[in-house]
Interface confidence: low
């Protein structure tokens, strides 16, 4: 793994300028900055469909979560798409799985009080060779 | 973009909601979930017809400051023997997630939430075939 | 519309042969793998045999392995079951269906009968 | 191989309840799960496929939920013609196995 870094110089004559840490709760202005994405994934790209491990994707909505929707992919085959078209069951549609932070109401209904909170999504499938395991 | 309001009338706003100035939300960054992993298969970076190696951001100023992202090795896919098929394509799969920006101006310190796109993956593709007319 | 017809079904005496048949219509025959799922009388469904779209991949329940041998002929849009050393514990209704994804079985022929008995 | 087990395995119910059935998987089968109607005499009929999609032409009165290990198939309202035995399938690990299948009939 490569690692790629920046740094940003800061103030020198400021309070607690090598303060490295966040603290624990911060206000945030409430303007998400960078993109105003959330669609769906099937109107962004074909690869569900085109993949050689094609998914299907499932709206997971719930109203006290950041984004409110979040597309779920579940491989299609438990093989792959081979060149005839045909499931080649030698090889496996496996889930690619991504951790990401969402934010979630804090307390419960509350309109501007969130905390973060990491959650678990299959974003596609991709096709593998399997591991085989030989019996001694 | 604004945070939604939640839309659903037979939500109330409790009582307990704790006092916010205008314009900015409470953002509490200890993550719920924090141990929880991923439980994908082995290696699957290296196995799949699609590979791809990983390289860790690092930013100070970015809560959490390491955010993985993927390549992908080939612009084909590698077939039963092995070889690159350059007839099939390899393509990143992207996933949105959020990430906490510090901004310093000054000797102030303010806080932004930030989408960023990150590419999880690789999958082998049929390539899309433009006719010519 | 998606049409299978099993065919082949009889009565036979334990140890001896079958060749069931299913014509399929209104699919791409050859795009699809095909399954076999029997069922006992008066008992639940079992899962027999599943052949891959142009024949490569081929899988069998352990109760026929060794036994039953499926296959195919996408010119003639026919699925086959060779059974040999049939046992009374393969009575069943024999039936064929399509997979739409892996083991996703979303059409049904009506079934043939087969009674193995002395 | 993985052992679905239904319940119950007869339930007894007048037109317009309705009916519950439950399907439970001896290990996870994440949503690789159906629901099939096998009427006397015919082939099943696919209602439900991976935990909670309706097949081409089912009615809306048939909805599944679950995932993981317990699995329901919900009949809102029964109609005359929903009285027939339901099979649940799991199509997560090889074998495919079924569950045992569970009656309703007319109360």
């Known amino acids: 793994i490569v690692k790629a870094g920046i740094t940003i110089p800061r103030n020198p004559g400021c309070p607690n300028s090598e303060d490295k840490n966040f603290p624990r709760t911060v206000m945030v202005n409430l303007n998400i900055h960078n993109r105003n994405t959330n669609t769906n994934p099937k109107r962004s790209s074909d690869y569900y469909n085109r993949s050689t491990s094609p998914w299907n994707l499932h709206r997971n909505e719930d109203p006290e979560r950041y984004p409110s929707v979040i597309w779920e992919a579940k491989c299609r085959h438990l093989g792959c798409i081979n060149a005839d078209g045909n499931v080649d069951y030698h090889m496996n549609s496996v889930p690619i799985q991504q951790e990401i932070l969402v934010l979630r109401r804090e307390p419960p209904h509350c309109p501007n009080s969130f905390r973060l909170e990491k959650i678990l999504v299959s974003v596609g499938c991709t096709c593998v060779t399997p591991i085989v395991h030989h019996v001694a | 973009r604004k945070i939604p309001k939640v839309g659903h009338t037979f939500f109330q706003k409790p009582e307990s909601c704790p006092p916010v100035p205008g314009g900015s939300m409470k953002l509490d960054i200890g993550i719920i979930n924090e141990n929880q992993r991923v439980s994908m298969s082995r290696n699957i970076e290296s196995r799949s017809t699609s590979p791809w190696n990983y390289t860790v951001t690092w930013d100070p100023n970015r809560y959490p400051s390491e955010v993985v992202q993927a390549q992908c090795r080939n612009l084909g896919c590698i077939n039963a023997q092995g070889k690159e098929d350059i007839s099939m394509n390899s393509v990143p799969i992207q996933q949105e997630t959020l990430v906490v920006r510090r901004k310093h101006q000054g000797c102030s310190v303010s806080f932004q939430l930030e989408k960023v796109l990150v590419t999880v993956g690789c999958t082998c593709v049929t390539p899309v075939i433009h006719h010519v007319q | 519309e998606v049409q299978l017809l099993e065919s082949g079904g009889g009565l036979v005496q334990p140890g001896g042969s079958l060749r069931l048949s299913c014509a399929a219509s209104?699919?791409?025959?050859?795009?699809?793998?095909m399954n076999w799922v029997r069922q006992a009388p008066g008992k639940g469904l079992e899962w027999v045999s599943t052949?891959?779209?142009?024949?490569?991949?081929?899988y069998y329940a352990d109760s026929v392995k060794g036994r039953f041998t499926i296959s195919r002929d996408n010119s003639k849009n026919t699925l086959y079951l060779q059974m040999n050393s049939l046992r009374a514990e393969d009575t069943a209704v024999y039936y064929c269906?399509?997979?739409?994804?892996?083991?996703?079985?979303?059409?049904w022929g009506q079934g043939t009968t087969v009674t193995v008995s002395s | 191989e993985i052992v679905l087990t239904q319940s119950p395995a007869t339930l007894s119910l007048s037109p317009g309840e309705r009916a519950t059935l439950s399907c439970r998987a001896s290990?996870?089968?994440?949503?690789?799960l159906a629901w099939f109607q096998q009427k006397p005499g015919q082939a099943p009929r696919l209602l439900i496929y991976?935990?909670?999609n309706r097949a081409t032409g089912i009615p809306a009165r048939f909805s599944g939920s679950g995932s993981g290990t317990d699995f329901t198939l919900t009949i809102s309202s029964l109609e005359p013609e929903d009285f027939a035995v339901y099979y649940c399938?799991?199509?997560?690990?090889?074998?495919?196995?079924f569950g045992q299948g569970t009656k309703v009939e007319i109360k």
């Open positions: 399938q799991q199509r997560s690990n090889w074998p495919p196995t």
């Open positions: 991976d935990a909670s």
């Open positions: 209104g699919f791409t025959f050859s795009s699809y793998a």
């Open positions: 290990q996870s089968v994440s949503s690789f």
């Open positions: 052949i891959s779209g142009r024949g490569g991949s081929i």
């Open positions: 269906a399509k997979e739409e994804a892996t083991w996703d079985f979303d059409y």
